[in-house]
Interface confidence: low
């Protein structure tokens, strides 16, 4: 039975040209995390594999930095980065958990810096 839950940074906003950290936290399960995928709608941004480490998709390598923790840092944000982001936790023996984050990239200087959670 899948008992875990994913906490995310939720709906967040950031300034155009700035940076933001996307963060998910899997709790309430003793399952082992084998891999975390970060996806933007239908595109793979990055993979963090427990054995192989990080892989950033070539088309994003200049604007995506791994971490902190299992999170993902997006840099040099553009308005086109607005949209849904998904953290997909592959675990054993539970299976797959998915968290959703909505990022809005704003022109103004009043954008919120999103919350994030520490990965133990």
């Amino acid at each position: 039975m899948m008992t875990g839950t994913i906490e995310t940074t939720g709906n967040i906003s950031a300034e155009k040209g700035g940076s933001i950290i996307l963060q998910c936290h899997l709790s309430s399960t003793t399952a082992q995390v084998t891999q975390v995928n970060w996806e933007q709608q239908d595109q793979l941004l990055a993979i963090c594999n427990a054995d192989l480490g990080w892989h950033i998709s070539p088309s994003f390598k200049d604007r995506v930095a791994p971490g902190p923790g299992l999170g993902l840092t997006l840099q040099s944000l553009t308005v086109n980065d607005t949209g849904e982001y998904f953290c997909i936790y592959h675990t054993y023996p539970d299976g797959t958990y998915t968290g959703r984050i909505f990022l809005e990239v704003l022109e103004s200087s009043v954008a919120e810096h999103g919350a994030r959670f520490q990965i133990p």
Epitope: S19, I20, I21, A65, P66, G67, P68, G69, T73, Q75, V110, A111, E112, H113, G114, A115, R116, F117, Q118, I119
Partner: antibody, heavy 116, light 107 residues
């Protein structure tokens, strides 16, 4: 303009506790993380932890988990750090700073002196 | 924790010279590095974020470079007001950590 205001100094006795403040102004307090950083005389900088005023989430450096407690009063846009069971090792300047990963605004620091 | 090692501990340069500060991380951290200046009895001031991104209000003579484990802060023409301690800081893993600092002196 964006500012973080801290009291200049605190003199406390060994074994006691101290609670210092960091009052924010010039921006939306609930939108930015507040960090706390320690600097002993003549030494470098140590990150203690941070707190997100929008949701009250905290993260601590393991070395300070039993020493520091971070709290908020969002009604007055003020962050607090309490240090407990003080010793001479806790004598330092404590800065609050704003930011997520990088710290773009800093307070002037509170000098804590632990002395009997 | 990620260890940041700054070298040298002290740099001594003449006004107008170019100077470079080194920061080495104990593991690869992408470009998750910041640089701060701290003048005597002052608070730290953010100079560079995410390795090379400039900060509003910071003179253009300050620049950052590097990725992975090796990072550099450069001042292309040192002025007397640049006398200070310089610290790197990583935001790749918690806890955030700082380097030990490099003191800039003017000859």
């Amino acid at each position: 303009q964006v500012q973080l205001q801290q009291p200049g100094a605190e003199l406390v006795k060994p074994g006691a506790s101290v609670k210092m403040s960091c009052k924010a102004s010039g921006y939306t307090f609930t939108s930015f993380w507040i960090n706390w950083v320690k600097q002993r005389p003549g030494q470098g900088l140590e990150w203690i932890g941070d707190i997100y005023p929008g949701r009250g989430i905290t993260n601590y450096n393991g070395e300070f988990k039993s020493k520091a407690t971070l709290t908020l009063d969002t009604s007055s846009s003020t962050a607090y750090m309490q240090l407990s069971s003080l010793t001479s090792e806790d004598s330092a300047v404590y800065y609050c700073s704003r930011g997520l990963g990088y710290f773009d605004v800093w307070g002037a620091g509170t000098t804590v002196t632990v002395s009997s | 924790d990620i260890l940041l090692t700054q070298s040298p501990a002290i740099l001594s340069v003449s006004p107008g010279e170019r100077v470079s500060f080194s920061c080495r991380a104990s593991q690869s951290i992408g470009t998750s590095i910041q640089w701060y200046q701290q003048r005597t009895n002052g608070s730290p001031r953010l100079l560079i974020k995410y390795g090379s991104e400039s900060i509003s209000g910071i003179p253009s003579r300050f620049s950052g470079s590097g990725s992975g484990t090796d990072f550099t802060l450069s001042i292309n023409s040192v002025e007397s007001e640049d006398i200070a301690d310089y610290y790197c800081q990583q935001s790749y893993r918690w806890p955030y950590t700082f380097g030990g600092g490099t003191k800039l002196e003017i000859k």
